[in-house]
């Protein structure tokens, strides 16, 4: 494959990444799959600057990001280290609330209406953001 040098149509470029902002709502797993099919991943927030950029585009609507703890510890979908990385949780979050009886806690993270993060049950029909890096190899064949 070739290196992607510009963003696909309807994606927004920012700091060498491309972002796609959904309008519809999906469960976290469906949103995750959607991004993967686009050769991308759910957004991984690595800085306050990126947080502000995403927040500006999504507005006051709950929106999934690429952070979950479905297998135990919190993990970013692209492997970015959670412990040392940027975080913007709401106060008292994540509470990984186990009361819902789904066999685990609230396992998926989303931007709330004020942009700060909350963990929630993963079946909620929230919007989502896909991200892909411009410098990574594309799955598409090079243009001749």
């Amino acid at each position: 494959g070739s290196e992607r040098t510009c963003c696909p149509v309807n994606w927004v470029e920012h700091e060498r990444s491309c972002y796609w902002f959904s309008r519809s709502g999906k469960a976290w797993a469906d949103a995750d799959n959607y991004c993967r099919l686009e050769d991308a991943h759910l957004v991984v927030v690595t800085s306050w600057e990126e947080q502000k950029f995403v927040q500006h585009h999504i507005g006051p609507v709950n929106t999934w990001m690429g952070l979950h703890d479905q297998n135990g510890p919190w993990k970013w979908v692209d492997g970015t280290d959670y412990e040392t990385g940027f975080k913007n949780w709401r106060p008292e979050q994540p509470d990984d609330w186990y009361g819902h009886g789904l066999g685990g806690g609230e396992d998926c993270a989303h931007f709330t209406d004020d942009g700060r993060w909350n963990d929630d049950v993963c079946q909620r029909p929230y919007r989502w953001v896909c991200e892909t890096e411009l410098d990574k190899a594309s799955q598409e064949p090079p243009l001749l």
Epitope: G25, P60, V61, W97, G99, E106, V121, Q123, R124, P125
Partner: antibody, heavy 120, light 107 residues
Framework: QVQLVESGGGVVQPGRSLRLSCASS????????MHWVRQAPGKGLKWVAV????????YYADSVKGRFTISRDNSKNTLSLQMNSLRAEDTAVYYC?????????????WGQGTTVTVSS | DIQMTQSPSSLSASVGDRVTITCRAS??????LAWFQQKPGKAPKSLIY???SLQSGVPSKFSGSGSGTDFTLTISSLQPDDFATYYC?????????FGPGTKVDFK
């Protein structure tokens, strides 16, 4: 105060169409998702459809999918339900209801309902 | 789709009684459950949301509890105005299914 008023109900023959409206007042309509819920005579409540605050998303019960269309006009603070290919089992009181937020947080305020009767 | 069941389907009670209605989801729905009251010929009225949060203006004799699959609505001391049908509704994801209702009438 917050108010929802439905209109447009009536008697209609099977296979025909009808359009219900819901006028809102007392709150900022464009900030809230809106729902339709129906209740057949002597029966329980059935959720019909939702439209998000900005009209970007709509979702339907399987029983009405492909026949009913929910829409909104935020400039006029009105919600609509276009009902096509009506069947006898669509006979019900139809309520519009406000979502607690943009469209995924449940229902808080309800209208008084409008009656639809599908009969030949 | 997730199914909602309520029990009992009807109950007879007296003024002053403590009344408990249960709602069960066929799969976990988190805290995303609401309770509504409906009187004959009237629109439903919201009582409880997020399983246990009291709707503004609703008296504190109404309370909700539970999470996941099992939920309860309790009326601590039944008053004449409380004789009605009560519905639960899930709103974790679409469709927002209602339970079949519980009718509370005079003993």
């Amino acid at each position: 105060q917050v108010q929802l008023v439905e209109s447009g109900g009536g008697v209609v023959q099977p296979g025909r169409s009808l359009r219900l409206s819901c006028a809102s007042s007392g709150f900022t309509f464009r900030n809230y998702g809106m729902h339709w819920v129906r209740q057949a005579p002597g029966k329980g409540l059935k959720w019909v459809a939702v439209i998000w605050f900005d009209g970007s998303n709509d979702y339907y019960a399987d029983s009405v999918k492909g026949r009913f269309t929910i829409s909104r006009d935020n400039s006029k603070n009105t919600l609509s339900l276009q009902m096509n290919s009506l069947r006898a089992e669509d006979t019900a009181v139809y309520y519009c209801a406000r979502d607690r937020s943009v469209g995924y947080d449940g229902l808080d305020v309800w209208g008084q309902g409008t009656t639809v009767t599908v009969s030949s | 789709d997730i199914q909602m069941t309520q029990s009992p389907s009807s109950l007879s009670a007296s003024v002053g009684d403590r009344v408990t209605i249960t709602c069960r989801a066929s799969q976990g729905i988190g805290k995303y459950l609401a309770w509504f009251q409906q009187k004959p010929g009237k629109a439903p009225k919201s009582l409880i949301y997020a399983a246990s949060s009291l709707q503004s203006g609703v008296p504190s004799k109404f309370s909700g509890s539970g999470s996941g699959t099992d939920f309860t609505l309790t009326i601590s001391s039944l008053q004449p105005d409380d004789f009605a049908t009560y519905y639960c509704q899930r709103y974790d994801t679409y469709p927002f299914t209602f339970g079949p209702g519980t009718k509370v009438d005079f003993k």
